[in-house]
């Protein structure tokens, strides 16, 4: 099977299998520096469920900015340029990390925390109830 | 005017505005009770930009499996639901946070690691390059 | 000390491209969003884009295709680059950080540099 | 894009005065709205922030007030060296936008 190796110069903590309180490293290390950054920007005017950016601010978060998708339209945006009520424009979501200050208004004293935000919109097919 | 409070137990800590190793506490806290997941469980297959969820996982990084979006389609599922080449299918992506384990194999010490995911698809109107 | 500083060529012709340099030093470009701004010679301000701390960008829709916003955070330094440029384009460009103690805001500006679009 | 209605785009006050200047934006901006203030020749200086934050080092006279859609900026008694052109700035929403400034001169 695989075994996991573990490494002898590790700091010291009581519970080896989930440790409840860990130290962390706010030194961010970024993984994306070979993309594009412009590789995705203007989606969310091109989209057929275009979206605006709106702000949610939380100090006591980290990151205490985060920017959210709200779908311009009920309906999606048909080959006219005209929104077709026939579809929906729908959030796409996703749970995050972030860390919450603990107790609050600590610099150094986190909790890890999950949390739902909307990431872009997506055109779908609507789900047709009909009535008996 | 804003008053920006400080609570008098935190622990202690030698930069007070950006630290750079912080305790974590990894019982995590789930803001998301109250919504359904279910609620966009099924966006991917009703978008007329449909996407497949792949797995990504790896042991040295909480979490340790994240479910990655790939589009099925380089264009888009129209009204008859044939794939649309004159539309684009493309992913929305959203940088996330990680713990990375730091050094590595080490249960209780991480870094904390800025990863780029794609969530799910989009559809798009192409840029059209016009060749003078 | 916070300090931003633009750099750029000053005068470019008409449908030519530009690049202005903003260089930042006392703080750490992976740490802080930078935003773009400019200003029209005698009108008012008006935002260009952001270059988020993990390096995404978001920028205005009317200039989106003509204009990139990319960083080197090892050099301190972001990049604002301007394609078919026009005169139009003529105006102060200024780089400021969003930072704050609590909230967040535009706390530090550049002093501007300033484009001239002309033949 | 949530447009910024700045009033008035000009106004003559003594000195000592109180002053107060208004932006109305055109969607809830849930009080993401900064002031600045602008002197010839030189980059705008951020004097409020999130619509009531005194930014460090900005002399208390200055304030500013609102929500949803309607802001104030007010000065409470005039000095000669608050001369000059303010603007608010909306940051709720993508694009960021300004109004379109207030030149403020001496009476």
């Known amino acids: 099977g695989i075994t996991i190796p573990r490494n002898p110069g590790c700091p010291n903590s009581e519970d080896k299998n989930f440790p409840r309180t860990v130290m962390v490293n706010l030194n961010i290390h970024n993984r994306n520096t070979n993309t594009n950054p412009k590789r995705s920007s203007d989606y969310y005017n091109r989209s057929t469920s275009p979206w605006n950016l709106h702000r949610n601010e939380d100090p006591e978060r980290y990151p205490s900015v985060i920017w959210e998708a709200k779908c311009r339209h009920l309906g999606c945006i048909n080959a006219d340029g005209n929104v077709d009520y026939h579809m929906n424009s729908v959030p796409i979501q996703q749970e995050i990390l972030v860390l919450r200050r603990e107790p609050p208004h600590c610099p150094n004293s986190f909790r890890l925390e999950k949390i739902l935000v909307s990431v872009g919109c997506t055109c779908v097919t609507p789900i047709v109830h009909h009535v008996a | 005017g804003i008053t920006i409070p400080r609570n008098p137990g935190c622990p202690n800590s030698e930069d007070k505005n950006f630290p750079r190793t912080v305790m974590v506490n990894l019982n995590i806290h789930n803001r998301n009770t109250n919504t359904n997941p279910k609620r966009s469980s099924d966006y991917y297959n009703r978008s007329t930009s449909p996407w497949n969820l792949h797995r990504n996982e790896d042991p040295e990084r909480y979490p340790s499996v994240i479910w990655e979006a790939k589009c099925r389609h380089l264009g888009c599922i129209n009204a008859d639901g044939n794939v649309d080449y004159h539309m684009n299918s493309v992913p929305i992506q959203q940088e996330i946070l990680v713990l990375r384990r730091e050094p590595p194999h080490c249960p209780n010490s991480f870094r904390l690691e800025k990863i780029l995911v794609s969530v799910g698809c989009t559809c798009v109107t192409p840029i059209v390059h016009h060749v003078a | 000390q916070v300090q931003l500083k633009e750099s750029g060529p000053g005068l470019v012709a008409p449908s030519q491209s530009l690049s202005i340099t903003c260089t930042v030093s006392?703080?750490?470009?992976?740490?802080?969003?930078i935003h773009w701004l400019r200003q029209p010679p005698g009108k008012g301000l008006e935002w260009l884009g952001v270059?988020?701390?993990?390096?995404?960008?978001h920028s205005d829709s009317a200039l989106m295709s003509r204009l990139s916003i990319s960083k080197d955070n090892s050099k301190s330094q972001v990049f604002l680059n301007v394609h078919s440029l026009r005169p139009e384009d003529t105006a102060i460009y200024y780089c400021?950080?969003?930072?704050?103690?609590?909230?967040?805001?535009?706390?530090?500006w550049g002093q501007g540099t300033t484009l001239t679009v002309s033949s | 894009d949530v447009k910024m209605t700045q009033s008035p785009s000009s106004m003559y006050a003594s000195l000592g005065e109180r002053v107060t200047i208004t932006c109305k934006a055109s969607?809830?901006?849930?009080?993401?709205l900064s002031w600045f203030q602008q002197k010839p020749g030189k980059s705008p200086k951020t004097l409020i922030y999130r619509a009531n934050g005194l930014v460090d080092g900005v002399p208390s006279r200055f304030s500013g007030s609102g929500s949803g859609q309607d802001y104030s900026l007010t000065i409470s008694s005039l000095e000669y060296e608050d001369m000059g052109v303010y603007y608010c700035?909306?940051?709720?929403?993508?694009?960021?936008?300004f109004g379109a400034g207030t030149k403020l001169e001496l009476k």
């Open positions: 400021a950080r969003e930072g704050g103690d609590y909230y967040k805001y535009l706390d530090f």
């Open positions: 270059i988020w701390a993990g390096g995404r960008t």
């Open positions: 700035l909306q940051y709720e929403m993508l694009p960021l936008t």
């Open positions: 969607h809830d901006i849930n009080s993401y």
């Open positions: 006392g703080f750490s470009l992976i740490n802080y969003d």
